[in-house]
Every structure is written in C-alpha cells, then in structure tokens.
C-alpha cells in the first residue's frame, strides 16, 4: 500500500538557526521515510532534507540548516513519502520567510518611573541579537500589578534599529508595583518570540488616593455623650503600596462650624464622644506629596428615625465563597455598607467593613474567615449621606461538631418522671448552628431511649419512667456537621411520690 499523501505541511523559520517543516500523518502503518524538497533563493536553487531510513524514519519533521537559509526569501516545500510500495507526493506549498520567522525574545533591562511623570513606567529593552537588522519589529507588552493574576496587553511596533529601545506605558496606578514581560516578532510574521524574563517596576508615589470612612454608633453614656468609633481605610482602587504619614479629622455639629474640633492621628480608627445632635465628620490622609480627597460622614442625631428598606437577606456558601444577598424595597438605594465580625461572648477583636455599590450582594472568599466561627453580618443601606437601618444575619463558612456538649442536670425527679435542664453551649464552643438537642437515657441494664428537641428548648420532662430505677442520661448538641455529647449524669426515680400521703391501716 502506498503511503498516505503528506498533508498539513507547516513550516517555521527560526531566524539564523533553521527552517523546520512538519506534516501529517506523523506515523504510518508500514515503514515510511520522507524527502522534503525545497526551492529557495526565490526559486533559483533547490535542495532536499531527508528523514533517512535509519535514524529518523517515520518522523514527520525535517530541518534545513545554514548556510543555505537565505532571508528575505520565498521557499517552496514539497514532501515525498516513500515506502516499499512507492512514492506519494504532497502538494507544493509556498513560504515567505518574513511571514514565518520566529526570533528570540527581547531582553528587558529596566522598568523605571520617570521623575515627575505620574502613573507611567518606561520600559527599556535590548532588541534580540538574532533578529533581522533592518526589519520592523512588532511587540506585545504584557503587564500586571504584582498581586494580580490578570495580564493586560499593549501592542506596538518599532522601526528603529537601536540596540536598546524604550516604551512609555501610561495610565497606570500610582505607587504600584508592576510586572512586565515582552515578546516580539518581525512585523509580517505570524510567529511570536517567546516571552522575555519578567521584570518589576514601581510607579511614582502620589498624594493619597482617598479614604473609605465608616463608624460604629455605641449607646449613649450616662452623661449623655455618645461614643462613636470612627474607622477608615484606603479607598477601593487605591495603590497597594500607598502609605499615609497620618490622618486629619475634623468634626462639628450640623450648622455650627464654629464648634469644629480637629484631631491628628496615625491610627486608622478613632473614638469620638459626640453630643446628641447631628454631626459631620471629615477625614483626610496625607503623605509627603499632599492630601487625599476628603472623606465625609454624617452622624445622625440620637433621636433621628432611620429609614428601613432591606426586606430579607440570605447567606449561602459556594465552593470557595460566602455570598450574602439581600432584597430591598428602595430601588434608589445603590450603596450599602457591610459589616462583619466574629460573634463571641467578649468584645469582638476583629471588626471588618466594606462598601458595596450597584449590587445587592456581597462576596467574601471563605479563606478570609475562620472556620468554626460564627460571624455576624450586617448590611446598612446608604442613600447619599443617610445611613438606614441595618439588616443582620449570621453565618459560618465551615461548621464542625461542638467542642463540648451541654452541661446537664436532673431536676424534679419523680416516680416516673424527671425534668432535664441543660445550659446553652458557649458561643466559642458551638462550631456551628445548633440544630437540635438529643436526650439519650437508659435504665440500668435496660434499653436506650432518645428524644430530639429543637435548639430553642433547654428543658425537657421525661415521662413513663420505671419507679425506683437508676438511669444514666446525657444530652447531645448537634450542628450540621454532627453532634457532641454532654456530661453523663445519673439519677434514680423515687419509689413513692413525695406528695403522696401515707395512711396507716390498723388491724
């Protein structure tokens, strides 16, 4: 059987290295060798490249080597497949070397900001040594911020033949580290070089970008003063590297700027003690280059009625995220503040908050929250300068079985009844939402019985017990992950009721 006609011929010119063609089929049933016939020097010359019988038979690739690789040039390539039964020729294919040339990657030697030019990096590189000297090269510059996985790209061409070349990358973020990599190709070529080694550069620092500002309103003190915990952080979109030297705060009662008070701090939180009126609070951050835009917050009067518009809220878990969604009756509200903190018996050690715009959901990666911890999540509607009533829910990103079971005691022991009471497990030991409690009880040498009750029940009366019998009992608290038994207690039912009057019969 004749070999199959060689097809899908594909050639690439590795500049000043080789000209390589591949084709299909890659494997033949019977032993096949190939002859690649080339015409070059614009059809003036011809030669062959053989996959010889011994070493490279059945190998669907062949390379032509210097010095017969001329550029620029047009080649024709024809592949002949031969086996014991005869020869099968491919069609003649035509190759313009400029269109299939692959060159070495360029080498970036510096990525630097230019003094006084904001949000720009100047990339300098060396044109690959193995590249045609006179040809226009096209480039793709890939860049990303150092903590991002997503590359952005910009394309450009360079005609000059300087050994080192430059490109000014503009519209970047201030004071941000960028990773750069560059590839190139002759302008007419379909084959790009590999990517250069990555190089890092940092844009110039600027005055701070801005702040996000929030507050926690605490109950008024006995003297009528209200503690307000102010907190702020770099605005979303601010450069990662941005550092503030400090923060200026000023605040005053509404319509009374004469009573303005100012504070300077290097912390990102500050407690104010305000009167019962409406107050306005302003915060700016500053560094050696200037101040950020002003962040503004209105603190409502003590007696102000706040609007309510969140009707319902759901927290659900995806594979790697916690998603909180809410429904609102106010379509005009499109900004929300989300607070989250661990639900612990003591004062929460970590309090987090984030603004959400033009969405009615909030997402957090599971790994940003601790497993087995309950989180309080509150969402506040924000309409211009007014903050509405929050809607709150609780969530675990991962539940476990409780670390301890309920502490249980037996009360009101009767002849056939007993009342069992147990305490709620401390928050720190629940490890999940308590779904229910199960009471396991068993008479000495008897069968075990169980009774399951809702999580809001902390007392249960067992009936139909056997008089004057010893029982062991324990209560199990269960989460979605499973249950944990509390301490085992023992009690004995009475032989006669304490309330029973004894009549002595005289004979």
């Amino acid at each position: 059987v004749l070999p199959a006609k060689p097809e899908n011929i594909s050639c690439i010119f590795y500049y000043e290295e080789n000209f390589t063609c591949t084709w299909s089929p890659e494997k033949e049933a019977s032993y096949t060798w190939y002859k690649v016939k080339r015409t070059y020097s614009y059809g003036y010359k011809s030669d062959i490249c053989s996959t010889d019988n011994s070493t490279r038979g059945n190998h669907a690739s062949c390379s032509f080597l210097p010095p017969t690789i001329t550029n620029p040039d047009n080649y024709t390539i024809q592949v002949e497949a031969q086996n014991a039964d005869g020869i099968m020729k491919s069609d003649i294919t035509y190759w313009n070397l400029d269109a299939i040339m692959k060159i070495e990657p360029p080498e970036i030697f510096s990525v630097k900001s230019v003094l006084g030019i904001k949000r720009m990096l100047q990339i300098k590189w060396i044109r690959p040594v193995l590249a045609p000297h006179s040809s226009t090269l096209k480039y793709t510059l890939r860049f990303r911020t150092i903590n991002s996985a997503y590359w952005m790209e910009v394309n450009f061409t360079k005609e000059d033949i300087d050994r080192d070349e430059t490109y000014n990358l503009t519209e970047l973020q201030a004071f941000t580290e960028y990773v750069m990599t560059l590839r190139c190709a002759p302008a007419e070529s379909m084959f790009w070089s590999g990517w250069s080694q990555e190089k890092v550069g940092t844009t110039e620092e600027e005055a701070p970008y801005g702040l996000d500002l929030w507050r926690v309103l605490k109950p008024a003190m006995v003297d009528g003063r209200r503690p307000v915990q102010l907190m702020w952080k770099k605005a979303t979109g601010a450069p990662v590297l941005e550092k503030a030297l400090g923060y200026n705060i000023w605040y005053f009662p509404e319509n009374n700027t004469n009573l303005t008070e100012t504070v300077n701090t290097t912390n990102q939180t500050h407690e104010l003690y305000l009167g019962g009126k409406t107050y306005w609070v302003y915060v700016v951050s500053y560094n050696s280059l200037g101040e950020s835009p002003v962040a503004t917050l209105r603190i409502p009067a003590l007696n102000e009625k706040t609007f309510q518009c969140i009707e319902a809220m759901q927290a659900c878990l995806t594979q790697d995220q916690l998603v909180v969604e809410w429904q609102s009756s106010a379509p005009e509200v499109d900004t929300w503040m989300v607070e989250w903190f661990p639900d612990v018996d003591s004062e929460p050690s970590s309090f987090s908050w984030e603004s959400v715009s033009q969405a009615r959901n909030w997402t957090i990666q599971k790994d940003e929250l601790k497993p087995l911890w309950c989180y309080n999540i509150s969402v506040y509607p924000v309409l211009r300068d007014r903050v509405g009533q929050p809607y709150s829910t609780q969530a675990y990103v991962q539940e476990g079985i409780p670390s301890a079971g309920p502490v249980t005691q037996a009360d009101s022991i009767g002849v056939k009844t007993v009342t069992i009471t147990w305490k709620e497990i401390p928050k720190s030991k629940r490890n999940g939402f308590i779904k229910n409690y199960t009471i396991f009880y068993q008479a000495e040498d008897g069968k075990e019985f169980s009774k399951t009750v809702n999580s809001n029940i902390l007392q249960y009366r067992l009936e139909s017990l056997t008089r004057r019998t010893s029982y062991s009992l324990q209560v199990m608290a269960s989460t979605n992950a499973g249950g944990t038994n509390g301490t085992k207690i023992n009690f004995k039912t009475l032989s006669i009721s304490h309330h029973h009057h004894h009549h002595h019969h005289h004979h």
């Epitope: 016939k37 015409t39 614009y42 059809g43 003036y44 010359k45 011809s46 002949e80 020869i87």
Partner: antibody, heavy 117, light 113 residues
Framework: EVQLVESGGDLVKPGGSLRLSCVAS????????MAWVRQAPGKGLQWVAS????????YYRDSVKGRFTISRDNAKNTLYLQMNSLRAEDTAMYYC??????????WGQGTLVTVSS | QPVLTQPPSLSASLGTTARLTCERS????????VSWYQQKPGSPPRDVIY?????PSEVSKSFSGSKDTSANAGLLLISGLQPEDEADYFC???????????FGGGTHLTVLG
C-alpha cells in the same frame, strides 16, 4: 503582459567587449531573479548567468567567470550583461529570461552576438 | 558534474503518445525538479512543464510530466500528438554543483503522417 526586450547584440572581434541590455515590463522586476541563457546556432540551450533580486548575488557558468558580469538596475527595470574578452565559442543568440521556481517562465526574443575576426 | 542526456531525435505518429526522456548521469533524479521547454524555429523557448509535473495554464492538457526513478530520468509525455507539437524539447534541472540551471541537449520531435 510580461515582456522582455533584449538589445546590444552585434558582430565583434575575438577579445572585444559588448554590453547586452534587457528591458522588462508587465511584472515587479525587483521581486525576481533574472538570467541570461544563450543558444549557439543549431545547438542546445546553455545557462550563462543569473542575478538575485537586489543584485547582491550573482552566479555564472564556469566558462564565462571573470569575463562576463551580470548586473541590474531595478529603478530602470533593466538587466545587463557585460561581456569582455569575447571568444568565438561565445557566438550565440542571447536570451534574457525571468526565473520562476527552478525554471524560466518568460523569455525575450533574443539578441544575436557574433564573435568573428 | 551531472549531465542531462536527451536522445537527439524522436519520431511518433499523429494521435499517438510521445515519451521523451531526460536521463541524469549522477545524483538522484528524485532529489531535484525537472522542467521542460518547447522551442520552434525562430522563436525563444517556452515552458510546457515545470517542477516535475506542473503545467502552465495556457499549455494543452496533452502534456504531462513525471519521473522514472528506476531509469533516473525525467519524462515528458505528449498524448494525442498533433502536427503543431513538432519542435525541439529541452529538459532542465537545477544543479547544486554548479549552483545554477543545467539543460539537456534537446530532442527534436517529429510528428509522422
């Protein structure tokens, strides 16, 4: 339509010189190798010389090396053959030919060179 | 240096097929391409077959090219011979040794009757 028009052929004494010209039209002259091919009266064809697209590479048959020079002026679409130290055996019809892929796809009508005392 | 050898003359009858050969003296005929030219008196040559088996669009389909590897020769077949096919036929190949084209001596084809 591709046209190749040769000129410059003449009767010349042995040892003399002659310059042949070939004006091309109907194709992008600078994109193709060009050649001179000769044919002695009643004989076969004989390749004489070829030149690359830009003129940087030239190729000659052994018997004319050092005596003949092929050149081109792409701006004028013209091919030349400078023939020095002519011999009787150089007598032939000289054709200007355009190289295709390993063959000559267009030929001129030829110009006759006679070397005789 | 390889030489392309053609029989000086060949006669064939009208309507039959003429088989013109071009034998390569050294090197494999399969390693390069063979082209064929037709030349009539007082005219320059014109190509009828190039790169082994390709036929210019203006050339009659009765012309075909192939190779006889066992004879190390290029072949020109002219089927259904017509009187206008009477001419000199030259084969040509590229010779890497001389870095240039090489021609065969030519075959004069006569079409009988």
């Amino acid at each position: 339509e591709v046209q190749l028009v040769e000129s410059g052929g003449d009767l010349v004494k042995p040892g003399g010189s002659l310059r042949l010209s070939c004006v091309a039209s109907g194709f992008t002259f600078s994109n193709y190798y060009m050649a001179w091919v000769r044919q002695a009266p009643g004989k076969g064809l004989q390749w004489v010389a070829s030149i690359s697209t830009g003129g940087g590479n030239t190729y000659y048959r052994d018997s004319v090396k050092g005596r003949f020079t092929i050149s081109r002026d792409n701006a004028k679409n013209t091919l030349y053959l400078q023939m020095n130290s002519l011999r009787a055996e150089d007598t032939a019809m000289y054709y200007c030919a355009k190289h295709g892929t390993l063959y000559f796809d267009y030929w001129g009508q030829g110009t006759l060179v006679t070397v005789s005392s | 240096q390889p030489v392309l050898t053609q029989p000086p003359s060949l006669s064939a009858s009208l309507g039959t097929t003429a088989r013109l050969t071009c034998e390569r003296s050294s090197g494999d005929i399969g390693d390069s391409y063979v082209s064929w030219y037709q030349q009539k008196p007082g005219s320059p040559p014109r190509d009828v077959i190039y790169v082994d088996d390709q036929r210019p669009s203006e050339v009659s389909k009765s012309f075909s090219g192939s190779k006889d590897t066992s004879a190390n020769a290029g072949l020109l077949l002219i089927s259904g011979l017509q009187p206008e096919d009477e001419a000199d036929y030259f084969c040509q190949s590229y010779d890497s040794n001389i870095d240039g084209p090489v021609f065969g001596g030519g075959t004069h084809l006569t079409v009988l009757g």
